[in-house]
């Protein structure tokens, strides 16, 4: 029987009974948070052979081996992964061995086995026989191998029963437990699976089979399962489902979901039965099972039950992620927040249409409304008292509505209202009237000319740059000295700059009133000499990178209740010079004949310009005499070389650091201090562990029901 779509067993070990009749778990299997040590010996699920997603074990007290629970688990497909992993064993306090002696294939994803204080038989498993690539495996913080004394079956009696393979230059027996070898197929089978009797399975089988060369006798399928047969692709009029089987249209149409989007059911797209159309596609009609490409961003209609959606935090904005049409009214009331402008853009930036009104009040954290970067239509089907469909009241730091040179916004019905926005220039409001087609709708009191913009320098003069000079990591710019009517009103200049790969940035990008700003800022004092033009040297820049730069004059904003003129420049785009590229990455060389070497590499992470060619240099090296110095047939004469495995746990390094032999006659000496690169790698490693642990906790801990 197929079970699914993912099974979560927690708190009570008796929930394991849910696995009783499962042969395939279509989805994941979580076994976690069972804090009372139980006797699991009476629980055995020999029917279970395949998990299509991943297996996660976390804090299950009393469980000592998985072999008794899942003696026939053969394949974990990894169709969906848990943080890139198909097998996660984390903080299993009593687990002594993994013991999944029939596990032959993890189709996709890596394994993470971490913080299992009692877990042994890890170095005796050759994961390369199970996974395609072992480089992403993370096996850290388990019982130190020295304390394990792992012995494979028959080793003590000097009648070893298991086969040997090489891992990290160590040729050794491979087993899961003290009495279970790791199964290996004859080399004649190549990539194919094999039976218990070492006969090769059909090429479409994965993991194992009950009879040789028979596509109906597979334990699991390499590609897809359909009507009892393993097939390379789904037959006509059937569709891939969950990455492992073929289903017909009727099956797909009859899948019921508990997701909020289920009103329309599953779809068929690109030969697959899936829950929703993929990114960039939309259903071809509301009850259709088929997808067509969207023109531009895909429409997503979002509706608020209470008609008015209040955006007072990032969390409330999150509910609108992906929405393009909002049915209802938006009330924006953002008083504080961290990195608020870019967060709001992330969650509300796709909204194109609001059917009701938009009201922005007491939003002291906002400097601009540019986070609504795709808003093009306010229908005004519902209006505020007084027939307002755009209402902006008491926003202490609001300076810009939108960049009207690049913005088309129509307000179909209703008026606009603006009051008590001290940094919002009236000229900006008048410009909005023109663009939105609301000019003439507003009465005199709707746009208050006294309390809008009274704390801003609204009539801006333009500062002109006079010179720019660049090097690989510096830009020198100068600009005309600004002369307001009264020179005492000019305090200083502020230069704003940031990386800008494209020439599409605006002054208010990523800026909010709570300190977040995507621009770097530098203050420039007035030159004491009146004839010298002000300027700045921007240093520490990246080579061959385009920067956007603009300058603002810092002026006194009030002179006896008159608005005074400010000044700022246009945004200037300027690219630093090219420089030497960083080194090419991942250089690998291999010989494919007695006279040829194949060398491969990846481009440098920092090209610092346009790469035009690579220079490859090589030279002949003398043979290493070290190879001839020892009699390799005499076991005790082989020099002991330690190979770093890159995952040394701090607590596992117990040797005295003064025991390394430094070669020659020097005798013992201290371990070398860690290089900056090693320290950085250790720091990143610790950070990576933390990130994973946070992900794990966030994924599996859910609040208790009330």
């Amino acid at each position: 029987e197929i079970c699914g779509p993912g099974i979560d067993i927690r708190n009570d070990y008796q929930q394991l009974k849910r696995l009783e009749n499962c042969t395939v778990i279509e989805g994941y299997l979580h076994i976690l948070l069972i804090s009372k040590a139980e006797d699991y010996r009476s629980y055995r699920f020999p029917k279970l052979t395949v998990i299509t997603e991943y297996l996660l074990l976390f804090r299950v007290a009393g469980l000592e081996s998985l072999g008794d629970l899942f003696p026939n688990l053969t394949v974990i497909r990894g169709w969906k992964l848990f943080y890139n992993y198909a097998l996660v064993i984390f903080e299993m306090t009593n687990l002594k061995d993994i013991g999944l002696y029939n596990l032959r294939n993890i189709t996709r994803g890596a394994i993470r086995i971490e913080k299992n204080a009692d877990l042994c038989y890890l170095s005796t498993v050759d994961w390369s026989l199970i996974l395609d690539a072992v480089s992403n495996n993370y096996i850290v913080g388990n019982k130190p191998p020295k304390e394990c004394g792992d012995l494979c079956p028959g080793t003590m009696e000097e009648k070893p029963m298991c086969e040997k393979t090489t891992i990290n230059n160590e040729y050794n027996y491979r087993c899961w437990t003290t009495n279970r070898c790791q199964k290996m197929c004859p080399s004649t089978c190549g990539k194919r699976a094999c039976t218990e009797n070492n006969e090769c399975c059909h090429p479409e089988c994965l993991g194992s089979c009950s009879a040789p060369d028979n596509d109906t006798a597979c334990v699991a399928c390499r590609h897809y399962y359909y009507a009892g047969v393993c097939v390379p692709a789904c037959p006509p009029n059937t569709y891939r489902f969950e990455g492992w089987r073929c289903v017909d249209r009727d099956f797909c149409a009859n899948i019921l979901s508990a997701e909020s989007s289920d009103s329309e059911g599953f779809v068929i797209h690109d030969g697959e039965c899936m829950q929703e159309c993929p990114s960039g596609f939309i259903r071809n009609g509301s009850q259709s099972m088929y997808c067509i490409p969207c023109e531009g961003p895909c429409p997503k209609v979002c509706e608020e039950e209470k008609k008015t959606k209040t955006i007072d935090s990032v969390t409330s904005a999150q509910m609108l992620q992906g929405c393009t049409i909002f049915k209802g009214n938006l009330l924006i009331n953002i008083r504080r927040g961290n990195n608020i402008a870019s967060e709001l853009e992330n969650f509300m930036g796709l909204i194109e249409v609001v059917t009701g009104y938009v009201k922005i009040r007491h939003s002291h954290a906002l400097v601009s409304l540019s986070f609504l970067k795709n808003l093009r239509l306010i229908l005004g089907e519902e209006q505020l008292e007084g027939n307002y469909s755009f209402y902006v009241l008491d926003n202490q730091n609001l300076q810009q509505l939108w960049d009207w040179d690049h913005r088309n916004l129509t307000i179909k019905a209703g008026k606009m209202y603006f009051a008590f926005n001290p940094k919002l220039c009236v000229s900006e409001i008048y410009r909005m009237e023109e663009v939105t087609g609301t000019k003439g709708r507003q009465s005199k009191g709707d746009i208050n000319t006294r309390n809008n913009g009274e704390r801003a320098s609204c009539e801006s003069d333009v500062l002109h740059f006079t010179s720019t000079t660049t090097s690989k990591n510096r830009i020198i710019i100068t600009w005309h000295r600004y002369r307001p009517p009264d020179y005492r009103d000019l305090i200083s200049f502020t230069v704003y700059y940031k990386e800008a790969p494209f020439k599409n940035v605006t002054e208010y990008d990523g800026q909010d009133a709570c300190g977040s700003n995507s621009w770097n800022m530098v203050d420039v004092d007035l030159p004491p000499n009146k004839d010298v033009e002000p300027g700045i040297l921007l240093h520490g820049l990246k080579p061959w990178t385009q920067y956007a730069v603009y300058v603002k004059a810092v002026t006194l904003t009030m002179v006896e209740n008159d608005h005074i003129r400010g000044a700022k420049s246009e945004i200037l785009y300027i690219r630093t010079n090219a420089s030497v590229p960083s080194i090419p990455l991942d250089v690998l060389s291999a010989s494919n004949s007695s006279s040829q070497l194949i060398v491969k590499w990846n481009p440098p992470s920092l090209p610092n310009g346009n790469l035009s060619y690579y220079i490859v240099r090589w030279q002949r090296q003398p043979q290493d005499g070290y190879l001839y110095r020892h009699n390799y047939c005499s076991k005790d004469k082989i020099p002991i070389r330690k190979y770093a495995d890159g995952t040394i746990d701090i607590e596992e390094v117990t040797e005295n650091p003064k025991t390394e032999v430094c070669g020659g006659e020097k005798g013992p000496c201290c371990a070398c201090p860690k290089t900056e690169a090693e320290k950085q790698a250790e720091k990143e490693e610790a950070e990576y562990r933390k990130v994973f642990e946070n992900f794990l906790h966030n994924s599996i801990f859910v609040p208790r029901p009330e």
């Epitope: 197929i2 779509p5 009749n21 009859n254 899948i255 019921l256 979901s257 508990a258 289920d262 029901p705």
Partner: nanobody, 123 residues
């Protein structure tokens, strides 16, 4: 953990009607696909009907199509089965079942089950 309790079973004459209820507690009710299964004496358990989390989509076994109606009230955490035109072959213990996220047409192993309520159709 989800607890399911069925009610509404009883003795009814052929052609009569009955309404079964299933009260759920323990987790967000709307995040489960809900189903009715039944088991007649000496027979295998069989699927009767299922409903999506929002209550907008349903599925019925051919044997009950047009006679039974499944519904749910997410505000009351309750699943219903309205059974009309009852026949003798509808006699069985009716079980309510819940599965998180989704349910495929071939799914028999639901995550959570009720204890069942007996429906007897007899003259």
């Amino acid at each position: 953990e989800v607890q399911l309790v069925e009610s509404g079973g009883g003795l009814v004459q052929p052609g009569g009607s009955l309404r079964l209820s299933c009260a759920a507690s323990g987790r967000t009710f709307s995040s489960f696909v809900m189903s009715w299964f039944r088991q007649a004496p000496g027979k295998e358990r069989e699927f009767v009907s299922a409903i999506s989390g929002s209550g907008s989509r349903f599925r019925y076994a051919d044997s009950v199509k047009g006679r039974f109606t499944i519904s749910r009230d997410n505000s009351k955490n309750t699943l219903y089965l309205q059974m009309n035109s009852l026949r003798a072959e509808d006699t069985a213990v009716y079980y309510c079942a819940a599965n998180p996220r989704r349910a495929t047409p071939d799914l028999q192993q639901y995550a959570y089950w009720g204890q069942g309520t007996l429906v007897t159709v007899s003259s």
